[in-house]
Interface confidence: medium
């Protein structure tokens, strides 16, 4: 058993089959020594007398909210969470595997840039009594800080049958070194609270592998005399990291037409212009990456041909 | 060329090797096979490689206050990833793919290295792991190992050498 | 094209030594470490050391251990097998073969008798 | 040290046959990259051993594909579709996960 906050306890327990549970002992926060009674949650049946409560946690009916009282008036309360092991293996029952890049994904983070700022989300299928609280530091034996705001829902999806929940949360490095090499990752650790049951979710990256830059912006066409060809122009998105002579972006210009079908003509360029053929109905798309570090592809910035 | 206590870099020339390594060193790490750094034991070869940190003066500002401190910074490390490419994590069994860039990826190492510190000039240079040959099973680890951490260190280098040619070329 | 071309057969005594050579052509020769196989008469093929020829360094097999050494000379592409106090079970072919075994010399027989 | 055993010693095929040859390895060779490092040599008389197959399934370079090979971490078999007159010599695996890399006994391939 551990305190996940004031009054607030997890107990971890092997769940299998006529698994003997944990023993924990509740202590009532009173100076007062004699007359104390236990109830459980909104139950009145007395469950113990006495400065302390001896329980067998097995099941999730054995957590919930004990309450110490004497004469009718509440002392102290404790809030018992089971945190579930199977096979030795922690249970993510709350989060959906989101299974990119790879299966066991929960979490999934990005950055718009090196300045040590980052959104990381996460989804369930559940859509009440649930908390998240989230920490982040860089580093775990001698972390050093990363703030992270509260997680808050960002979006709702009908997928099938099903209702899906996104979840975002905002984090900022204190100290943030964009231009030095990152040595130790950031650690982001998410504590789920669904009812009376705890997880816990941890993803451990550099920000240099989360980059994905937002669109190129003011993408424009401008026709050349007597041809078919066209000069692209666009400009860095005001988000990615200054100067651009030291954060370079590469860019990928496509000319896709109406079709799916059709074949797409790509060009790829260092600078923020390219000369394209454009086809009738086609469009001219473009889109940005990291010059020296292969991390995300921006999405696409468009405008059609005509 | 750049000498230590003194004159600049060809900054050009170092921007288009940089930029070189940084597609060669990703063209080398698809090769090793794919696996989870973070889930794998730490090895000793890949904590001591040096890295660009934030009090290396390779940031613009430190860049334009003087460049020195960050191009010794950068020379070390070429010399230690050009040694650990030729190295019998590399150089052993598993052999590597037949049309493996490791080869060209430890010469331009040694050429951008070269580049920086011309013959006859001496920066210290870091003290490079043993590299006594490990295992072939670990072997496949490290190699990703350092071609990750490599990929980092020379995207640093390429965006001080593009800041440089910019900025500070004559 | 990779070749690798050793030196001749060798008649040797008991107690003497042998320095076997393997001049390697057609690749850069400080990319591949390079293996030294042997095999006795109607024996299996068996592996007695590598040799990294950047750094010298080697690994050797326990078997031959004090008595084996791997040497590379760079400049001249060639890597040597030196094995002392030698036996009349030590009497077989003696191959070096590049990293990854693709590629292999021709054979040098060293017969050691008295 | 990792013990190869291959078997049989002599294999006596009609040509135009398939052939089968089994070597076995004291410890896994599987990796957790997922690849085994194991390898197949044919020595034909008074010749160096050639490379047939790498990391256990892989064929190399100008191998006939009749030849094949397959496996689990620690069981190998080479397989030839069709025997030919030029497949005779000794067939030999090997293992290069560990050091000292070492080879099976050997099985001698002839035509009946």
């Known amino acids: 058993i551990w305190e996940l906050k004031k009054d607030v306890y997890v107990v971890e327990l092997d769940w299998y089959p006529d698994a003997p549970g944990e023993m924990v002992v509740l202590t009532c926060d009173t100076p007062e020594e004699d007359g104390i009674t236990w109830t459980l949650d909104q139950s009145s049946e007395v469950l113990g007398s006495g400065k302390t409560l001896t329980i067998q946690v097995k099941e999730f009916g054995d957590a919930g909210q004990y309450t110490c009282h004497k004469g009718g008036e509440v002392l102290s309360h404790s809030l018992l969470l089971l945190h579930k092991k199977e096979d030795g293996i922690w249970s993510t029952d709350i989060l959906k595997d989101q299974k990119e890049p790879k299966n066991k994904t929960f979490l999934r983070c990005e950055a718009k840039n090196y300045s040590g700022r980052f959104t990381c989300w996460w989804l369930t299928t559940i859509s009440t009594d649930l908390t998240f609280s989230v920490k982040s530091s860089r580093g775990s034996s001698d972390p050093q800080g990363v703030t992270c705001g509260a997680a808050t829902l960002s979006a709702e999806r009908v997928r099938g049958d099903n209702k899906e929940y996104e979840y975002s949360v905002e984090c900022q490095e204190d100290s943030a070194c964009p231009a030095a090499e990152e040595s130790l990752p950031i650690e982001v650790m998410v504590d789920a609270v669904h009812k009376l049951k705890y997880e816990n979710y941890t993803s451990s990256f550099f920000i240099r592998d989360i980059i994905k830059p937002d669109p190129p912006k003011n993408l424009q066409l401008k026709p050349l005399k007597n041809s078919r060809q066209v000069e692209v122009s666009w400009e860095y998105p005001d988000t990615w990291s200054t100067p651009h002579s030291y954060f370079s972006l590469t860019f990928c210009v496509q000319v896709q037409g109406k079709s799916k079908r059709e074949k797409k003509d790509r060009v790829f360029t260092d600078k923020t212009s390219a000369t394209v053929i454009c086809r009738k109905n086609a469009s001219i798309s473009v889109r940005a990456q990291d010059r020296y570090y292969s991390s995300s592809w921006s999405e696409w910035a468009s405008v059609p041909c005509s | 060329r750049a000498v230590p206590g003194g004159s600049s870099p060809a900054w050009t020339q170092c921007q288009q090797l940089s930029q070189k390594l940084c597609t060669l060193a990703w063209s080398a790490h698809p090769l090793v096979g794919h696996m989870d750094l973070r889930e794998e034991g730490d090895e000793e070869t890949t904590n001591d490689v040096p890295h660009i940190q934030c009090g290396d003066g390779c940031d613009p500002q430190g860049l334009r206050d003087n460049s020195q401190f960050c191009l010794q910074r950068i020379h070390q490390g070429l010399i230690f990833y050009e040694k650990l490419l030729g190295s019998d994590i590399f150089t052993g069994e598993p052999s590597l793919l037949p049309d493996s860039p490791v080869g060209q990826l430890h010469a331009s190492l040694l050429g951008l290295s070269q580049l920086l510190q011309p013959e006859g000039h001496h920066w210290e240079t870091q003290q490079i792991p043993s590299l006594s040959p490990s295992q072939p099973w670990q072997r496949l680890l490290l190699r990703f190992k350092i071609l990750r951490s490599l990929q980092a260190f020379v995207a640093v280098a390429a965006r001080v050498f593009a800041h440089g040619a910019a900025t500070l070329s004559p | 094209e990779v070749q690798l071309v050793q030196s001749g057969a060798e008649v040797k005594k008991p107690g003497a030594s042998v320095k076997v050579s393997c001049k390697a052509s057609?690749?850069?020769?400080?990319?591949?470490?390079m293996n030294w196989v042997r095999q006795a008469p109607g024996q299996r093929l068996e592996w007695m050391g590598v040799?990294?020829?950047?750094?010298?360094?080697?690994t050797y097999n326990q078997k031959f251990k004090g008595r084996v050494t791997i040497t590379v000379d760079t400049s001249a592409s060639t890597a040597y097998m030196e094995l002392s106090s030698l036996r009349s079970e030590d009497t077989a072919v003696y191959y070096c073969?590049?990293?990854?075994?693709?590629?292999w010399g021709q054979g040098t027989l060293v017969t050691v008798s008295s | 040290d990792i013990v190869m055993t291959q078997t049989p010693l002599s294999l006596p095929v009609t040509p135009g046959e398939p052939a089968s040859i089994s070597c076995r390895s004291s410890?896994?060779?599987?990796?957790?990259?997922?690849?085994?490092?194991l390898n197949w040599y044919l020595q034909k008389p008074g010749q160096s051993p050639q490379l047939l197959i790498y990391?256990?399934?892989t064929r190399a370079s100008g191998v006939p594909d009749r030849f094949s090979g397959s496996g689990s971490g620690t069981d190998f078999t080479l397989k030839i579709s069709r025997v030919e007159a030029e497949d005779v010599g000794v067939y030999y695996c090997?293992?290069?996960?560990?050091?000292?890399?070492?080879f099976g006994s050997g099985t001698k391939l002839e035509i009946k």
């Open positions: 073969a590049r990293r990854g075994f693709a590629y």
């Open positions: 057609g690749y850069s020769f400080t990319d591949h470490n």
């Open positions: 040799i990294n020829p950047n750094y010298g360094t080697t």
């Open positions: 410890k896994s060779l599987l990796y957790k990259d997922g690849k085994t490092y």
């Open positions: 990391l256990m399934s």
């Open positions: 090997q293992q290069i996960a560990e050091y000292p890399f070492t």
